[in-house]
């Protein structure tokens, strides 16, 4: 949030030289008026009166909704997730139709024995959930399921996923190649057939800081940009202080217009400043330039 | 849920016969596997035979191949080990287990359903 700039006079003076008596109003902002029954409000930018103030749309607030927010809150997940479809053939257990009930004692049975299976298989992945039969069929069983994935949002997730597939990927290709059947009998808790195991399809959380800014920012987007800190994304226009993208107007006012961040300086009693970043004072006695 | 109930051990002298029956219930099927394991003390369980109860297959191990006879009353739904020729090393205590499912295994871990032991103890 801005910080209010104590000053001794109430004019601004925009970097380009125009002064302006405040409040200030971008005048290159669109403006619509809000009217409801006999309260005629001036809530621009869409915003509506509701009996008391303007309701004002992200990105605008003030009396008015006339001017533009510094930061937009912007949610990311608590965690995001990848969804692996897998099939697997199991040995050890012959089909019966009974099976393809997922009420049945059998499914039910099956269900508990393959998911025990899954965890061993998948114990030193510290994404893997668990998994979820989707499908059971003839073949000795042919097992489709899901295997579930998550991790705590970071800017990195999709890599972090990533590389867990990879990981699950070996770790089933490694136990239906290991846990096969000798003799006609399984000595493991399960046996597959190395030849069923097949990927079909992987689903990653698709979420993007940087999209979801750039839409709540509306006809801002190309002046909002995305900055981390302590690897939680901020949606942030270059008039929030504290980010690399800090606009620093010294001694004047940050504002958003449709044009971009720009300063208005402030006049002072002995001094009124001037430049792009309000940086040049010029005392009023004297008339020199010192910065 | 599945139950299962031993019983029929006892001691025996090398060369005689036990039968052992291990009576089952509730089962929603009369199509599932059943099972006799065996552990002697300081040794790991093992499975002695298993029998699929709609005959589609049984399993000895090799050690009492011949010896020993596995078979299911599906009337009863009771299990039966018939043991001849017994000798001092088939001295354990011996399970039955039951799985709802067709199961080829011979795991312990894969048999999700357990009776009690029944002791059997064959002396020289």
């Known amino acids: 949030p801005l910080a209010t700039i104590p000053v001794s006079t109430t004019s601004l003076t925009s970097s380009e030289g125009s002064t302006i008596s405040t409040p200030s109003v971008d005048i290159s902002t669109p403006v619509t008026t809000s009217i409801v029954g006999d309260q005629c409000s001036r809530c621009k930018n869409g915003g509506f009166w509701d009996g008391l103030k303007c309701q004002c749309l992200t990105p605008y607030y003030g009396e008015s909704c006339e001017e533009v927010v510094n930061s937009i809150d912007i949610a990311p997940p608590e965690t995001v997730s990848a969804q692996m479809e897998l099939t697997v053939t199991v040995t050890s257990v012959k089909f019966t139709d009974e099976l393809k009930n997922h009420s049945s004692q059998e499914f039910r049975e099956f269900n508990k024995t393959f998911t025990e299976q899954m965890n061993i298989v998948y114990s030193g992945i510290p994404e893997y959930v668990g998994v979820n039969i989707t499908n059971l069929r003839l073949g000795s069983v042919v097992v489709e399921h899901d295997v579930l994935l998550r991790t705590k949002y970071t800017p990195e997730y999709k890599t972090a996923l990533d590389n867990a597939t990879e990981v699950v990927k070996q770790k089933i290709t490694k136990v239906t190649t290991e846990q096969i059947m000798t003799n006609d009998n399984c000595s493991a808790l399960m046996c597959f057939n190395t030849t069923g195991t097949q990927v079909q399809n992987i689903t990653v959380t698709q979420y993007d800081p940087v999209e979801e800014c750039r839409q709540k920012a509306e006809e801002y987007e190309d002046y909002f940009l995305v900055e981390y800190r302590d690897q939680k994304p901020y949606c942030i226009s270059p008039c929030e202080s504290g980010f690399n993208a800090s606009k620093n107007c010294n001694h004047g006012k940050c504002q958003m217009s449709q044009n971009g961040a720009r300063c208005l300086c402030v006049t002072t009693e002995t001094h009124w400043y001037s430049g792009e970043d309000c940086n040049q004072g010029t005392q009023k006695s004297h008339h020199h330039h010192h910065h | 849920d599945v139950q299962l109930q031993a019983s029929g051990g006892g001691s025996v002298q090398a060369g005689g016969s036990l039968r052992l029956s291990c009576a089952a219930s509730g089962y929603t099927s009369n199509r599932y596997s059943m099972a006799w394991f065996r552990q002697a003390p300081g040794k790991e369980r093992e499975v002695v035979a298993f029998?699929?109860?709609?005959?589609?297959?049984?399993y000895y191990a090799d050690s009492v191949k011949g010896r020993l006879t596995i078979s299911h009353d599906n009337a009863k739904n009771t299990l039966y080990l018939q043991m001849d020729s017994l000798k001092p090393e088939d001295t354990a205590m011996y399970y039955c287990?039951?799985?709802?499912?067709?199961?080829?295994?011979?795991?312990?871990?894969?048999?999700?359903?357990w009776g009690q032991g029944t002791q059997v103890t064959v002396s020289s």
């Open positions: 029998i699929w109860t709609d005959g589609g297959r049984t």
């Open positions: 287990a039951a799985s709802s499912l067709l199961l080829q295994t011979i795991n312990p871990r894969a048999w999700p359903y």
